[in-house]
């Protein structure tokens, strides 16, 4: 079998909302993946599991099941959304993200994603990690997801 390539493209959108009373930030982050099937047979994308970390704490998880079939020598772009919550011991971030004296409120998040593919009864898992800046002070949308060179740090080795 030839390789199945998973390429994390970047953040497609980040929608923010707040609960001032609870000093909590809600970030809905939509990411884009490119999955390439280099084989001469179809491959099933069984599931995608994703999580987002802030300061080594997991702030959001998501799982997509029975996603798609990728034909021979084909590529599919898949968007997935991870709802995240920055609260409790990280509630100090509410003050930063809603700080009235600045307009840009960048935070660094680690995006982790694992893609499970299957073909001929065989399963394979491919994982990626990427650090990304997100502005926790406003909604951000991209016409196209950020291309790889926009990622702020290299994935962990």
């Amino acid at each position: 079998p030839r390789s199945i390539e998973v390429k994390y493209i970047g953040v497609k959108s980040a929608y923010v909302s707040y609960d001032a009373e609870k000093r909590t930030i809600y970030l809905n982050i939509t990411n884009t993946l490119n999955i390439t099937n280099n084989n001469y047979y179809s491959v099933e994308v069984e599931n995608i599991t994703a999580q987002v970390q802030f300061s080594k704490t997991v702030i959001g998880k998501a799982r997509l099941n029975n996603i798609t079939n990728i034909g021979p020598l084909d590529m599919k772009q898949i968007d997935y959304t991870v709802p995240t919550v920055i609260a409790e011991e990280m509630s100090y971030m509410y003050d930063f993200c809603t700080l009235l004296s600045i307009k840009v409120h960048n935070i660094v998040l680690m995006m982790q994603v694992t893609v499970t593919t299957a073909y001929f009864g065989h399963s394979e898992q491919i994982s990626q990690e990427r650090y990304q800046y997100v502005d926790c002070g406003r909604n951000t949308t991209y016409q196209l997801a950020q291309s790889e060179y926009l990622n702020v740090l290299q994935p962990q080795q």
Partner: antibody
Amino acid sequence: EVQLQQSGPVLVKPGASVKMSCKASGYTFTDYYIHWVKQSHGRSLEWIGVISPYNDNTNYNQKFKGKATLTVDKSSSTAYMELNSLTSEDSAVYYCVRTYYSNYFDYWGQGTTLTVSS
Amino acid sequence: DIVMTQSPSSLSVSAGEKVTMSCKSSQSLLNSGNQKNYLAWHQQRPGQPPKLLIYGASTRESGVPDRFTGSGSGTEFTLTISSVQAEDLAVYYCQNDHSYPLTFGAGTKLELK
């Protein structure tokens, strides 16, 4: 429907003070910042400052510090701007504008016309 | 403070024409973290308050016709109207939304020939 209803036109004498209002409706007042913007006759727009109705925090354009004071009354969902020591230079239309925290201006009030003349 | 410079100051066009107006900022409006440009365009029709058209340099506000397109990055931005309609006659302002104090350009006035 979101509305920012501003107080009516005002004519005042030089040296006086004025307090204009911006009554918000159709949304949760404390969830959005209120900005104030000045538009002098036939001229561009100048940002005066912003207030958070939730905690009364403010941020002023240095140019308007000492000239403008921003306040809110949560009970009536109303934002106020007081301008003091008025001169003819303060004659303008003043707008209140809403933003969801640091997002872009999404709703503008209809404006309050201030005329300073003796 | 970031200075916003718009050109031309006025444009005289016929209905159906394509128009382009420019906005330049004295400092970059790019958030180098998320690679988003924090620039907005507002439309002000005669006797009305301004209205948000474009934010993030290129994202149309909901309800804004797709004949309005924003582009550019860093310090140079453009607003294009693909086919001008009578209701587009207005003054267009670009706005720095990257850092306080928020600043506006002097405006481009769109008039009918």
